[in-house]
């Protein structure tokens, strides 16, 4: 069964995949695809490398590690719920039926929006946005603003007052949830 990896909406997701090049610069073609690994290559290819470089990629998908040293881990930028599913990393080692293939399951959770410690009626404080940092591991999350005991009524009022704001739309569209306590 697939190894499972998790990320939140708005974060960068990280799917690890590695191999050891036979010699420095002696690279092996690798493909990443959305969906389990098929019989050959990758289905729905999102990124591909050849013996020298990344030769195909699509928006939001990139290799953050040093692929010339065999780190072909995939980063998916600013994930949405639609990015959930199985991904295939296929390392096309030369020879007769030598491919290494890995199915990785990505689970995307709605962003946790944590209410916070001061009474300012500021939407970004009551509904902190998640910031992501690019790095090798899963994206780190940071929250802006803060405030203590905010109750459901206050949240409801804030949301009503600012329901036309872009952030409110973002929260609705991404299925973000508000956690109390």
């Amino acid at each position: 069964s697939e190894v499972e990896y998790r990320a939140e909406v708005g974060q960068n997701a990280y799917l690890p995949c590695f191999y050891t090049p036979a010699a420095p610069g002696n690279l092996v073609p690798v493909c990443w695809g959305k969906g389990a690994c098929p019989v050959f290559e990758c289905g729905n290819v999102v990124l591909r490398t050849d013996e020298r470089d990344v030769n195909y990629w699509t928006s939001r998908y990139w290799l953050n590690g040093d692929f010339r040293k065999g780190d072909v881990s995939l980063t998916i930028e600013n994930v949405t719920l639609a990015d959930s599913g199985i991904y295939c990393c296929r390392i096309q080692i030369p020879g007769i039926m030598n491919d290494e293939k890995f199915n990785l399951k990505l689970v995307i959770k709605p962003a946790k929006v944590t209410p916070a410690p001061t009474r300012q009626r500021d939407f970004t404080a009551a509904f902190p946005r998640m910031l992501t940092t690019r790095g090798h591991g899963p994206a780190e999350t940071q929250t802006l603003g803060s405030l203590p005991d905010i109750n459901l009524t206050q949240i409801s009022t804030l949301a009503n007052e600012l329901r036309d704001s872009r952030l409110a739309n973002d929260l609705r569209d991404s299925g973000a949830t508000i956690r109390i306590g």
Epitope: P29, P38, V39, E41, G43, G95, M97, D99
Partner: antibody
């Protein structure tokens, strides 16, 4: 025009050898995996062999492993199948087929290989 | 090897009929199921890939569905040029394998 054209089929005795060719045109040949698929007279389709775009990864059905060798020359846009130690059960029409997004989306017209004494 | 079983093996139908051919895999194939049409003396032609996707140029009367192990090819309204043999093929497990074929004949 996008097409594949096989050649090299014919009559050969059991134990003999034959080399099939498949000339591609109209697309970026080196970007695709290719396969050979065969069809015995009056029978269904059987996958035989496949090769990666750079030619360095190859794949074979158990029925032909050790006897057949798939290769390609990307500078000539040509795919090959070297068939050795041929048997009567290898008699079939051999098709080359381009593999794209998990399907064989482009096929040649086929070349008939007959193994008989 | 993954065994692909098609049914029926042969089928008689008339122009304008709706026809369904089924294909069952011996194990789950993650939707990696293709359908091909072959006419006598000709090479196969890809009709459906990835269970339900239509290649450019294939008429919309052809459709595919299914997941896991059970898949279906439907021709919504048979045309004279549709009488042929149809094969399913799985592209998940090694080696790729084909069904035994379904011969669609004129009634």
């Amino acid at each position: 025009e996008v097409q594949l054209l096989e050649s090299g089929g014919g009559l050969v005795q059991p134990g003999g050898s034959l080399r099939l060719s498949c000339a591609a045109s109209g697309f970026s040949f080196s970007s695709f995996y290719f396969s050979w698929v065969r069809q015995a007279p009056g029978k269904g389709l059987e996958w035989v062999s496949a090769i990666s775009g750079n030619g360095r990864s190859t794949y074979y059905a158990d029925s032909v492993k050790g006897r057949f060798t798939i290769s390609r020359d990307n500078s000539k846009n040509t795919l090959y199948l070297q068939m050795n130690s041929l048997r009567a059960e290898d008699t079939a029409v051999y098709y080359c087929a381009r593999y794209y997004n998990t399907g064989f989306d482009l096929w040649g017209q086929g070349t008939l290989v007959t193994v008989s004494s | 090897d993954i065994v692909m079983t098609q049914s029926p093996s042969s089928l008689s139908a008339s122009v304008g009929d709706r026809v369904t051919i089924t294909c069952q895999a011996s194990e789950a194939i993650y939707g990696y199921l293709n359908w091909y049409q072959q006419k006598p003396g000709k090479a196969p032609k890809l009709l459906i890939y990835a269970a339900s996707s239509l290649p450019i140029g294939v008429p919309s009367r052809f459709s595919g569905s299914g997941s896991g192990t059970d898949f279906t090819l439907t021709i919504s309204s048979l045309q004279p040029e549709d009488f042929a043999t149809y094969y399913c093929q799985q592209a998940y497990g090694f080696p790729p394998t084909f069904g035994q074929g379904t011969k669609l004949e004129i009634k």
